[in-house]
């Protein structure tokens, strides 16, 4: 006869491991007992359990409550056992020794591999600011057995670097994603992808990028100077900028206080019907936690009568 087993049995942490050992004997042969032992190199054999044809399953105190026979129906030539709730410390070499009548003893070894799925964690790097050089955007760490694979999934251009730390029964892998921050990266997802044979599917953790920046400020509303004349209603100046975090706006007048009746509404400066006292230099001050910008414009409110008089003078001068 001969023993049938597996070279390697692989289970995920917490699952039950079936340790197979089947005696394929000639007719009339019977199995008297099957002894299971752990036989890691450098250590003596440690009895796990003994399956006796007459007295049933005997379990070592070290494995009390964790070793069982597979559920019925059972073949008397089957010496397989179930190791319940596999833990990392169960990983190793096991031997099945079968005593048969009348053929004698047979033995076989198998390796139990316990996969420890990783629990990845993603840590964002320091605050990203436009103008920085190559900066850490995020790091992702996963520990498992065997070592997990850690990669990145993103549309953002960057560089990755990985390092691994081996522990007694597992390995921790850390991957870092570096980039040169730019405003176009704002709101872009950066996803850490962890692969491992103990996972049914890859684990993914997504971090949304936030890059602090402040665009140059400009003022709109003076495109047609001829519209800025005495009596005009609804005249306004609008300050244009963008930033992360969103900026706040402040209006001042360089050559004095803001005239009465001028309304400040965030990025917009609204004027009452224009008078010559609205002429002056206006400054839009844009700021966020990252930076501040200024833009100034000169408003020159025209007096149509004065203008036409000038034109007459010019004409008469010619």
């Amino acid at each position: 006869g001969e023993l049938e087993t597996s070279d390697v049995v692989t289970v995920v942490l917490g699952q039950d491991a079936k340790l197979p050992c089947f005696y394929r004997g000639d007719s009339g042969e019977q199995v008297g007992q099957v002894a299971w032992a752990r036989v890691d190199a450098g250590e003596g054999a440690q009895e796990l359990a003994l399956l006796h044809s007459k007295y049933g399953l005997h379990v070592s105190p070290a494995y009390e409550g964790r070793v069982e026979q597979p559920p019925p129906p059972r073949n008397p030539l089957d010496g397989s056992v179930l190791l319940r709730n596999a833990v990392q410390a169960d990983e190793g070499e096991y031997e099945c020794r079968v005593s048969t009548f009348p053929a004698g003893s047979f033995q076989a070894r198998l390796r139990l591999r316990v996969l420890v799925p990783p629990l990845p964690s993603l840590n964002p790097g320091p605050a990203l600011e436009e103008g920085q050089g190559l900066t850490l955007a995020a790091s992702c760490t996963a520990e498992g057995s065997p070592a997990p694979s850690v990669t990145w999934d993103t549309e953002v251009k960057g560089t990755t670097s990985s390092r691994s730390f081996k522990h007694s029964r597992s390995a921790a892998v850390t991957s870092e994603f570096h980039l040169v921050p730019s405003r176009s990266m704002n709101g872009q997802p950066l996803t850490c992808v962890v692969s491992h044979p103990g996972l049914l599917q890859d684990q993914r953790i997504t971090h949304i990028l936030h890059v602090s920046f402040l665009a140059e400020a400009s003022v709109r509303g003076l495109e047609d100077q001829n519209l800025w004349h005495i009596g005009r209603e609804g005249a306004m100046l609008k300050c244009l900028s963008e930033g992360q975090p969103p900026p706040s706006y402040n209006w001042t007048r360089l050559d004095g206080p803001l005239p009465s009746g001028v309304r400040v509404d965030g990025d917009t400066l609204g004027f009452p019907p224009l008078t010559t006292e609205h002429s002056g230099i206006y400054v839009c001050h844009v700021s966020n936690e990252f930076s501040s910008r200024d833009s100034q414009v000169t408003v020159d409110v025209l007096d149509p009568q004065e203008d036409s008089g000038k034109q007459v003078d010019l004409v008469s001068a010619s």
Partner: nanobody, 119 residues
Framework: EVQLVESGGGLVQPGGSLRLSCAAS????????MGWHRQAPGKGLEWVAT???????NYADSVKGRFTISRDNSKNTLYLQMNSLRAEDTAAYYC?????????????WGQGTLVTVSS
């Protein structure tokens, strides 16, 4: 041949404890199994517990959690620690050595030791 001699039996009150011993001599194999059986007055033989050379154990449901079987291989001695004894544990306790033999197993029996649980 294997010879077995039990000791440690006696009278004990319900809830009390006793420790039985069994000294084995003779041609004991490396894959033997040792254990205890008992026979109450007027009843049939009942298996109590068995232990492998490596210390793996198996117990009858009726004694699980109360009785502990152990062995000292260097002295070829078997023990049965009996706690929380009940009247229904009253019986003759026999030590058994189970040896491989030809086409199966051969049981070697001791003479027995009497345990009486009574107030």
């Amino acid at each position: 041949e294997v010879q077995l001699v039990e000791s440690g039996g006696g009278l004990v009150q319900p809830g009390g404890s006793l420790r039985l011993s069994c000294a084995a001599s003779g041609s004991i194999s490396s894959i033997n199994l040792m254990g205890w059986h008992r026979q109450a007055p007027g009843k049939g033989l009942e298996w109590v517990a068995t232990i492998t050379r490596g210390g793996s154990t198996n117990y009858a449901d009726s004694v699980k959690g109360r009785f502990t079987i152990s062995r000292d291989n260097s002295k070829n001695t078997l023990y049965l620690q009996m706690n929380s004894l009940r009247a229904e544990d009253t019986a003759a306790y026999y030590c058994v050595d189970v040896e491989p033999s030809g086409m199966g197993w051969r049981d070697y029996w001791g003479q027995g030791t009497l345990v009486t649980v009574s107030s």
